[in-house]
């Protein structure tokens, strides 16, 4: 015969326990039913009646099979940093979430305590943990050839355009302005290697511009830590780099020949020596043994003629460990010095070893003073490279980076006045470098 | 320069365990986190975790939670990275690496041979 | 934890052609949120973070070096081979609070 179901209440078997939504009342001794979620017990059951439930109140909730007198309180409206992920009815409690930007800073069995904003990190720091429901930002300083100019609690720092031609170098807080061409996120496949001695790892650089008036600094992020790309010169590499030697034959050619035919027609010679320094580079203590990379303009006047030379090179920057105080919540620390590098400079990728400088000037000076003699501007262009260990040379050594020489006394022999007149003949331009040597 | 040298080959019977240093120079260590990452013999790359060396929080992968533990002294501008109850399928070639998806700067140690036999 | 499988395990190219490297999450999409590594190893030398961020070359890594995502896959794609870019390459998804590395891709010469 098939076991008798019992139904409830009823008195359990002795060493049995009730059954599946029941639950032992230990004043009646019964074994009795539970409310179904959304119900309490109005009336506890007796030998003789079961359990009377009754629906929740409204703001008041039970999950679960149970027989408590009184349903729970919803938690209380979820504040204005916090979203409701689900509302508050008969069966479920309302659960609070953080809202987008903000983290769980103290959470509770289900949902959140306590919002907290999202970190942010300020300009020339990325995102290097993005945040999660219940952890916050982590910002760290963008590596040298990277850049972050937003104060974002999601972006990550990301590499500097690559420029033909570079307008203004790229620093931590701010990508490279290339002038007027098209940039490009990386290194084109063609390169050009100029004729320098190259180092172990090879540079990709992009094709020799246009002939400009202007002074010109090619910009480029040396090579990551990684073994060189060999083989990836492009076709064109060769013609190119023949075009600009030729090119830089002719014009120290033209400029010989002027000056030998000023010499003949005995206008007294003056051989200005002017000289564009620039100190090596101390290593940057703050940041270890060797800061980010410099680069250093030189930069003419105003007048594309002018043979006023200045060096602009901005200090190494000096930077302090970033979440060491400190700090309101959605803020990055600000122990940091605010921008890495100053206009002169720019971050350059890890691998460049040593500082590297190219600099291209080009300096129209020579005239005499009836204006009828004038010196070829000639573009001259000069890498510098203090290899990998800076300590080599002496801190304060100065390396001098242009020479021009063969200019023309004048009445005065201001740098002002050396500036003869430029309109009888055009005079020939420099080609500006391609790019820095390789490294 | 910026180089991670690591600590030479380690010989280890099963259940020991080993401790593996990185030495970074020619950056600031707290800049960067330090990643783990090995290699077994033919095999692929496997990210073990990381830890930041400005404040020592770490992350590391699910498979070894509870069994490796990652440090910095920043006064000596090195990591560790502790692997216990070494196992026979351990045996692999250790990197450090302040490699990140987030930071591109992009330096790995020269590798540190750990081999578990008994 | 999330499984990230990558395909092909070998592709046999010639130099100049153009290869393409896929790295699929096995929980689904992968999105902005992973930001998609792309690691280069060759034998004896260091590793090389070749793409960031999902489509972002690292500094110094050539143009023809390129990441991109859809739906549940990310690509490297390289757009015509040479031949220092045989080599072994690792793609590597962020999850909330790890990384995962895909098994690799070895490209090899055909």
């Known amino acids: 015969l098939p076991a008798q179901v019992a139904f409830t209440p009823y008195a359990p078997e002795p060493g049995s326990t009730c059954r599946l939504r029941e639950y032992y009342d230990q004043t009646a001794q019964m074994c009795c039913s539970k409310c179904s979620p959304g119900q309490h017990a109005k009336v506890f059951c007796t030998k003789t009646s079961d359990t009377v439930c009754d629906s929740c109140e409204d703001s008041t909730y039970t999950q679960l099979w149970n027989w408590v007198p009184e349903c729970l309180s919803c938690g209380s409206r979820c504040s204005s940093d916090q979203v409701e992920t689900q509302a508050c009815t008969r069966e479920q409690n309302r659960i609070c979430t953080c809202r987008p930007g903000w983290y769980c800073a103290l959470s509770k069995q289900e949902g959140c305590r306590l919002c907290a904003p999202l970190r942010k990190c300020r300009p020339g720091f990325g995102v290097a943990r993005p945040g999660t429901e219940t952890s916050d930002v982590v910002c760290k300083p963008c590596a040298p050839g990277t850049f972050s100019n937003t104060t974002s609690s999601t972006d990550i720092c990301r590499p500097h355009q690559i420029c033909n031609v570079v307008a203004i170098p790229g620093n931590a807080s701010m990508d490279a302005v290339c002038t007027s061409t098209s940039p490009t996120r990386s290194m084109a496949p063609g390169a050009v290697h100029l004729p320098q001695p190259v180092s172990t790892r090879s540079q990709h650089t992009q094709p020799t511009p246009e002939p400009s008036t202007a002074p010109s600094t090619s910009f480029l992020l040396p090579m990551g830590p990684s073994p060189p790309a060999e083989g990836s010169t492009g076709d064109f590499a060769l013609p190119v780099g023949l075009i600009v030697g030729v090119t830089a034959l002719g014009l120290l050619i033209i400029g010989v020949v002027n000056c030998v035919i000023m010499t003949q027609v005995k206008k007294k010679p003056l051989c200005l020596q002017r000289e564009a320094k620039v100190p090596h580079l101390p290593a940057d203590k703050a940041r270890g043994t060797q800061g980010p990379e410099q680069q250093h303009l030189l930069i003419t006047a105003p007048s594309s003629s002018s043979s006023s030379l200045e060096s602009s090179a901005s200090a190494l920057d000096r930077r302090a460990p970033t979440r060491n105080q400190p700090q309101a919540p959605g803020v990055e620390a600000s122990g940091a010095g605010e921008a890495r590098a100053s206009t002169g400079s720019s971050d350059s990728s890890p691998g460049g070893h040593g500082t590297q400088v190219n600099v291209t000037c080009i300096v129209n000076v020579c005239s005499s003073s009836d204006h009828s003699s004038q010196c070829s501007s000639q573009a001259s262009s000069t890498m510098g490279d203090t290899d990998s260990s800076p300590s080599e040379s002496p801190k304060d050594e100065q390396v001098p980076f242009s020479k021009e020489e063969c200019a023309f006394r004048s009445q005065l022999e201001t740098p002002e006045t050396l500036l003869g007149s430029t309109e009888e003949k055009p005079l020939p331009l420099g080609v500006p470098d391609a790019g820095m040597k390789p490294s | 320069q910026v180089q991670l040298v690591q600590s030479g080959a380690e010989v280890k019977k099963p259940g020991a365990s080993v401790k593996v240093s990185c030495k970074a120079s020619?950056?600031?260590?707290?800049?960067?986190?330090i990643h783990w990452v090995r290699q077994a013999p033919g095999k692929g790359l496997e990210w073990m975790g990381r830890?930041?060396?400005?404040?020592?929080?770490?992350e590391y992968a699910q498979k070894f939670q509870g069994r490796v533990t990652m440090t910095t002294d920043t006064s000596t501008d090195t990591a560790y990275m502790e692997l216990s109850s070494l196992r026979s399928e351990d045996t692999a070639v250790y990197y450090c690496?302040?490699?990140?998806?987030?930071?591109?700067?992009?330096?790995w140690g020269q590798g540190t041979t750990v081999t578990v036999s008994s | 934890e999330a499984v990230v499988t990558q395909s092909p395990a070998t592709l046999s190219l010639s130099p100049g052609e153009r290869a393409t490297l896929s790295c699929r999450s096995s929980t689904g999409p992968v999105t902005t949120n992973n930001y998609a590594n792309w690691v280069q190893q060759k034998p004896g030398q260091a590793f090389r973070g070749l793409i960031g961020?999902?489509?972002d070359r690292a500094p110094g890594i050539p143009a023809r070096f390129s990441g991109s995502g859809s739906g549940t896959d990310t690509t490297l794609t390289i757009s015509s081979l040479q031949p220092e870019d045989f080599a072994v390459y690792y793609c590597a998804l962020w999850y909330r609070n790890h990384w995962v590395f895909g098994g690799g891709t070895k490209l090899e010469i055909k």
């Open positions: 020619g950056y600031t260590i707290t800049d960067f986190y």
């Open positions: 961020g999902t489509n």
């Open positions: 830890v930041d060396p400005e404040d020592g929080n770490t």
């Open positions: 690496s302040t490699w990140d998806g987030f930071s591109y700067f992009d330096y």
